[in-house]
Structure formats: C-alpha cells, structure tokens
C-alpha cells in the first residue's frame, strides 16, 4: 500500500506525543490549581483537537479556538498580569518566585501549549508529525500562531489595574510592534479597566548606565499606550540576577539599593 501524499511545510512537525502531553499537563494543572478543578481535561483535549484536526493548517481562525477558550476561562486578579516580549524565561522565573503574578503561560491554556507545536491535515483525522506551517515561510493563519494570538488577545482583554510587561533591553527593538505583545496585547488592553502599563526593561549582560526607558521604541510604546488613555510607566532593571534575588529575599540589605 502506497503511503498517502502529505503536504510538506517549512516548519517542524507536531511535538511528539502531543495528545498525551496536553492531557497530562491539563491533569497536572487542575490538580495544582483548585479554582480549575471543575475542568474536564478530556473535554479540553477534545476542544483543542477540534480546533485544528481535519482542517487545512493555513486556514485556521480564532473562531476555531472559541470552544477551547470557553472551557479554559480564567481570571487574573487586578494588578497581577505580567506580559512579556522576547524574554520568556526571566518572566517565568519571576512568576515562579512572585506566585501572585501571572503570565499567560501560568494560565491553563498557556500552560497546555507552552513550547509545543501542532497541526493537522485537511480532511483527515491525523496529526502531522512531519512538518507544520512556518509563520514566515508558509502562512500566518497556522494552528500554533492563531492559538497564541487568540489566547493572548483574551489574556490582555481580561487584564485590569496596573499591567506589567517585561521587555528585553538587549534587543535592537526593545519594543517590537510585530511581536505578540506589540501587535496583539497592547491593542487589547481595555482602558476602562487598565489604569496603567508599567514596562520593566531588562538590561543585558554587561552592566551599563543607559536609561533604556528613553529608548526610541519605548517612546513609541508610550505613544501607542497613551493614545488609548492608559498611563505609562517604565523601570530599568539593570541587574536581572539581583532583581530575581531581591524578589526572593526583599529584606536583603543589598536590595535597598537600585536593581
């Protein structure tokens, strides 16, 4: 029997053991988070699967993910949302220490999909483990990109109070309009609920005295935010290692000086 023809995409294929990983993560999450104990993980997997299985992987819509989004509805307390751009690891290290603040990946849906890739094939129930569409080389409406756009939009929409964002000061564009933060989250913060956005600009390796809050791209971010009637604040985090240490031990005498 000849193998059926399969579309070749430029991106890597679905993460191995994808269904098992999603299901296992869901079970683990609901066990650790009492407020999500009511969630039926089989239903979550079915909704996740239903968003991309049998569908052409370059024609996925936010609508496809609505059943999953509905099942994973969660709220973050006001002032506790942490967005990030191009500095995921530090943001996650921070929320692991500062347990009352939350990134998207600390929420059920973000936790389920973090670092995973997936896609299906048109008119078959199979998962494509060989290749999936690349955002640049193939198409932007692929299952992974649309998922993150959908859940990022929702995460930003539900944020309230003072929202924080961690930005990578080592990049040429500290604020990048094309990032998920710049293209989705910034535009979906609700001025009626969000009083301010506070950026934390994380400095790179070498200790320097630049004020990255005056970086042109940060000024651009402030311009976008202020036009939406949201106040903007900014802090330089000159020493990320010390910053994390001080989050762990705020009483440490060295934490009284600047970080």
């Amino acid at each position: 029997v000849l193998p059926r023809w399969r579309q070749q995409w430029s991106g890597s294929g679905t993460t191995s053991r994808f269904p098992e990983t999603v299901l296992a993560r869901c079970v683990k999450y609901t066990e650790v988070h009492p407020e999500m104990r009511h969630v039926d993980c089989q239903s979550v997997w079915d909704a996740f699967k239903g968003a991309f299985i049998s569908k052409y992987p370059c024609n996925i819509t936010e609508e496809d993910y609505q059943p999953l989004v509905k099942l994973g509805t969660q709220t973050v307390p006001c002032n506790k949302t942490l967005l990030w751009s191009r500095i995921k690891d530090l943001a996650h290290q921070f929320t692991q220490v500062q347990r009352d603040m939350f990134t998207l990946e600390d929420m059920l849906l973000g936790y389920l999909a973090d670092d995973l890739t997936w896609c299906g094939e048109f008119n078959t129930f199979e998962i494509n483990y060989q290749s999936c569409p690349d955002w640049r080389k193939d198409c932007s409406n692929n299952p992974v990109s649309v998922f993150w756009k959908t859940v990022s939009r929702r995460f930003a929409e539900t944020a309230c109070g003072v929202v924080h964002v961690m930005l990578n000061g080592s990049r040429s564009k500290i604020f990048d309009k094309n990032s998920t933060f710049g293209s989705v989250e910034v535009h979906n913060l609700q001025p009626e609920k969000v009083q301010a956005l506070e950026a934390w600009v994380i400095h790179g390796g070498r200790e320097d005295s630049r004020d990255l809050c005056q970086d042109p791209t940060i000024k651009e971010l402030e311009s976008i935010i202020s036009k939406r009637n949201i106040r903007f604040f900014c802090k330089n985090i000159y020493r990320p290692d010390k910053f994390l240490q001080c989050v762990k031990n705020p009483e440490d005498s060295s934490c009284l000086s600047g970080i």
Partner: antibody
C-alpha cells in the same frame, strides 16, 4: 512650521513662585518627550527636567529636585514648569525643547526662551 | 563644575579644520549616545550631531562627531565665519539619572 513658545518669565523675589508655559505647534505634541533647559547669564546650558509623552516618566536635575514640577497638557499642546522656593541661582533664560524623533536624549527643536530673574 | 569637560575656547582661520573635545566617564559618554549643540550668541541652541555621529537634515557635512571610550569629539572642517558660536556636548548620566551638558566651548574664527 514647528514652533515652541515660552512664556511666564519675569522678576520674582527669593522664595517666590513662578509658572512657565511652553506652547507647541506644527507637530504632534502628544508623540514627543519634552524638556526644560536653562542658561544663567554668561554661563553654559543646564538641563532642568524631562517629561515623557503621558507624564508617567519624569526626571529632574538635582539642583531643582523638590522645588520644580514639570507637567504637560496634551489636549492644549502645552508644557509647564512650576517653580517654587526660587533662589538667586535660578536666574536664567529658560528654554523648552522637544526630543528628537526616534532618538534617546537629543533635543531638536528649541523655543526662544523666557527670562526668569530672582532678586530682592 | 560640569560633569562633561570641554575646553573653554577654540579658534581657527577660515578653511581650517578644528576639533572640540568632550571628556566624561563610563556612566555618561561611554555608555550613552553623545549630542552636540551649536548656540550663536543671543539665540536658542541648535542640534548639530545626534547619536554620536549622526547629522540632522540641514546640517552641513563639514560637521562630524565621533566617540571613543569616555571621550567624544566634534570636528568642523572648512571653517566659516558663521561657525563662530558656543558648542556644547551633552549626554545621559546613569549615576546622576539625568541629562548633562559640557561647560561649552567658545569657537572663534580668526
């Protein structure tokens, strides 16, 4: 034409107060960081204060900290400098200046200045 | 006493090349962009060089900026009589958390 026009200067006694204004025109005021810089008679330029677009980020020179307050009203395209507890050494021409587009600390448009004299 | 050190005066004849120096430290010049302003007596300052060596449109290419370590320089070639003015370097100082100017250099065209 891009223009900045300062007003509000004058003669004031030590310990007194004054409020300077800077009216902006010819550019989108609400897209730019703004500054106050002063120049004492026969002396060099001294940076006084900087305010960000929405007013959430503000810097002051040590020499004016706690006495001067920078603010802005984007709906009126106006920058302000409230000066309290004035001293003789605050006597200077006060310039307002806008930050250069797509830049860090450069100031590309300056007003003609308003003179503040602190004397008894 | 300015944080950035400039010579109080400099001079040259028409057509000559003159260089004005600006000396600082790691917390200002080394880590941050340097700016140069020209101020003709009785008028407002004018931005001459930004981001170390960039010229705003309208500034002649006779003016050039450079930086090395904790020092910066402004070079003016083909000196002209209307270049007679005060020149100021400026940058950000991370220790002071503020913008800083040099004391200024008075350029005389002989």
């Amino acid at each position: 034409e891009v223009q900045l026009l300062e007003s509000g200067g004058g003669l004031v006694q030590p310990g007194g107060s004054l409020r300077l204004s800077c009216a902006a025109s010819g550019f989108t005021f609400s897209d730019y960081w703004m500054n106050w810089v002063r120049q004492a008679p026969g002396k060099g330029l001294e940076w006084v204060s900087t305010i960000s677009i929405s007013g959430g980020i503000i810097y002051y020179a040590d020499s004016v900290k706690g006495r001067f307050t920078i603010s802005r009203d984007n709906s009126k395209n106006t920058l302000y400098l409230q000066m309290n507890s004035l001293r003789a050494e605050d006597t200077a021409v006060y310039y307002c200046a806008k930050d250069n587009w797509n830049d860090y600390y450069g100031m590309d448009v300056w007003g003609q200045g308003t003179t503040v004299t602190v004397s008894s | 006493q300015s944080v950035l050190t400039q010579p109080p005066s400099a001079s040259g004849t028409p057509g000559q090349r003159v260089t004005i120096s600006c000396s600082g430290s790691t917390s200002n010049i080394r880590d941050n962009y340097v700016y140069w302003y020209q101020q003709v007596p009785g008028t407002a300052p004018k931005l001459l060089i930004y981001k170390d060596d960039q010229r705003p449109s309208g500034v002649p290419d006779r003016f050039s900026g450079s930086k090395s370590g904790t020092s910066a320089s402004l070079a003016i070639s083909g000196l002209q009589s209307d270049d007679e003015a005060d020149y100021y370097c400026a940058t950000w100082d991370g220790s002071l958390n503020g913008r800083v100017f040099g004391g200024g250099t008075k350029l005389t065209v002989l």
